[in-house]
Interface confidence: low
């Protein structure tokens, strides 16, 4: 009689993650009488996957009934599959021994393939926050897919965007993969409403990519625009002067009148207009006695926004003229050092 | 158009330094990585390694470590390969490639016209 | 490191013929292989990657196929500006590795 074979017709086997694993073995005879058993690997690190003889591998089951006398089919299922069961499972007859079985005869091997989803797209942007066009970093992450092949593509506000890099680790074989892309966006006045976007496309997926987001007002702070303004005499003596500031973002923002210097009145931005790009405008108003003014007055809005250094818009309210001739005077003027925050 | 112009061809003795450019135009210079490749007269291709553009991280083979080293000059646009203590066995064509921009997926797309190094007393 | 080999160094083609070039993975690839055409004194010039997919601007009388550890480059009408060195490469892992090229020669 020609010697026993153990065949396993399957060379490889493609398995989806969470799906269960059929891995087909059989023997031509039934001789020698000896036990199956599985293992994962060759060589002496080989690791033991199912024995018929003895054992508990709660996630193994066979495929018939191995109990049977004149039973040649020695094919198992792996349940619930991981990317870590990739591997190659050889099939391997042992003849029956004493005191231990001997390895007689071994099959050719399956390769197990595992199609692994990569897990939904982090996206990460940069811990300060940044004005206007000035570059910042975004980071995209995907981890746990097999196999290897990915695409990645960035978007803003639906356009694709080209300046990025993208990394797959690792470089050689592995069980699943991560990938790892850094965008650099330029951001505008007018991102407060805008949106990253990062895509990843992957066998696994069919077609319907992962997609992660960033929202650009969680990154971006918009400098406030300052305008100082002389309204109409509301009484004989005194003057409204208004401080508009116009087009910041975030709300977070402090005002400070000061009279020639001296601090008049300190204010927490509360009641604000937003406006369509999402920035915001507020409008704060100090009444002056000109009667209890004997020079001019140098009339200063100073406003610290989102715990930045604070910028500064002057007046000059000449008391020297009637109140009522005043009309509007907006000769306003920058403070120094602070004229490059104003835009 | 996607271009990659090297320096000109290398006299040296052994023992010597050269240091290759490749300049790169037509396309962002930061998004896809550079790689070295050597041809030794009549033999086949070798990878030597590659340069990230992007964070300016280096990777040699194994057979290119030690006496050779990627660099960058972004702001240039440029990427360099040096061969220090140059060896008789260095003499090659020397060729630049930028790599698939997914990732670390190496094929090469665009090829320098190639660097002629010459080792010889 | 993964060893590329083509058995075939030099292969003899008449115009208008169909020639294929072939070149074996010493380890499943998994599709990641390219194809290069090189002509004399000039840089390689890629064809195919991923097995299969052709480069921009590759005219469609050059095709890859294969699967695991066999691929094959094939140019279903010989021109006689195909008259190159043809090399593999497998972008599977590093160290990214070519084959030793095989002379397509037009009689």
């Known amino acids: 009689e020609e010697e026993l074979q153990v065949i396993q017709p399957d060379k490889s086997v493609l398995v989806a993650a969470g799906e269960t694993a059929t891995l087909r073995c059989t023997a031509t005879s039934l001789i020698p009488v000896g036990p199956i058993q599985w293992f994962r690997g060759a060589g002496p690190g080989r690791e033991l996957i199912y024995n018929q003889k003895e054992g508990h591998f709660p996630r193994v089951t066979t495929v018939s009934d191995l109990t049977k006398r004149n039973n040649m089919d020695f094919s198992i299922r792996i349940g619930n599959i991981t990317p870590a069961d990739a591997g190659t499972y050889y099939c391997v007859k042992f003849r029956k021994g004493s005191p231990d079985d001997v390895e007689f005869k071994s099959g050719a091997g399956t390769e197990l393939s595992v199609r692994a989803k990569p897990s939904a797209p982090v996206v990460s942007g940069p811990a300060a926050r940044a004005t206007p066009q000035h570059t910042v970093s975004f980071t995209c992450e995907s981890h746990g897919f097999s196999p290897r092949d990915i695409t990645l593509k960035w978007f803003k506000n639906g356009n694709e965007l080209s300046d990025f890099q993208t990394n797959v680790d690792p470089v050689g074989e592995s069980v699943s993969y991560s990938i790892h892309s850094t965008a650099k966006v330029v951001l505008t006045r007018e991102d407060v409403h805008s949106q990253v976007i990062c895509e990843v496309a992957h066998v696994t997926l069919q077609g319907d990519p992962l997609r992660g987001t960033a929202n650009l007002s969680e990154t971006i702070r918009v400098p406030p625009t300052l305008e100082v303004t002389q309204q109409p005499v509301r009484a004989e003596n005194q003057v409204n002067v208004t401080c508009q500031v116009r087009k910041f973002y975030p709300q977070r923002l402090q005002l400070t009148w000061l009279e020639n210097g001296n601090v008049s009145r300190t204010e927490t931005a509360s009641t604000v207009t937003e406006n369509k790009d999402g920035t915001y405008n507020w409008m704060s108003w100090l009444l002056v006695n000109v009667s209890a003014h004997r020079d001019d007055v140098k009339l200063t809005c100073q406003v610290e926004h989102d715990g930045q250094p604070a910028v500064s818009k002057s007046h000059d309210l000449k008391v020297s003229a009637h109140p009522k001739e005043q009309g509007s005077n907006t000769a306003a003027e920058n403070t120094g050092s602070n004229e490059r925050n104003i835009y | 158009q996607i271009q990659l112009v090297q320096s000109g061809p290398e006299l040296k003795k052994p023992g010597e330094t050269v240091k290759i450019s490749c300049k790169a135009s037509?396309?962002?210079?930061?998004?896809?990585?550079m790689h070295w490749v050597k041809q030794a007269p009549g033999k086949d291709l070798k990878w030597m390694g590659w340069?990230?553009?992007?964070?300016?991280?280096?990777t040699n083979a194994d057979d290119f470590k030690g006496r050779f080293a990627f660099s960058l000059e972004t702001s240039d646009r440029t990427a360099f390969l040096q061969i220090n203590n140059l060896k008789n066995e260095d003499t090659a064509t020397y060729f630049c490639?930028?790599?698939?921009?997914?990732?670390?997926?190496?094929?090469?797309?665009?090829w320098g016209q190639g660097t002629l190094v010459t080792v010889s007393a | 490191d993964i060893v590329m080999t083509q058995s075939h160094k030099f292969m003899s083609t008449s115009v208008g013929d169909r020639v294929s070039i072939t070149c074996k993975a010493s380890?499943?690839?998994?599709?990641?292989v390219a194809w290069y055409q090189q002509k004399p004194g000039q840089s390689p010039k890629v064809l195919i990657y991923?097995?299969?997919t052709r480069h921009t601007g590759v005219p469609d009388r050059f095709a890859g196929s294969g699967s695991g550890t066999d691929y094959t480059l094939t140019i279903s009408s010989v021109q006689a500006e195909d008259l190159a060195l043809y090399y593999c490469?497998?972008?599977?892992?590093?160290?990214?590795?070519f084959g030793g090229g095989t002379k397509l020669e037009i009689n």
């Open positions: 340069i990230n553009t992007y964070t300016g991280e280096p």
């Open positions: 490639a930028r790599g698939h921009h997914y990732g670390n997926y190496a094929w090469f797309a665009y």
């Open positions: 490469q497998q972008h599977y892992s590093t160290p990214w590795t």
């Open positions: 991923w097995a299969s």
């Open positions: 037509g396309y962002t210079f930061t998004n896809y990585g």
């Open positions: 380890q499943d690839v998994s599709l990641a």
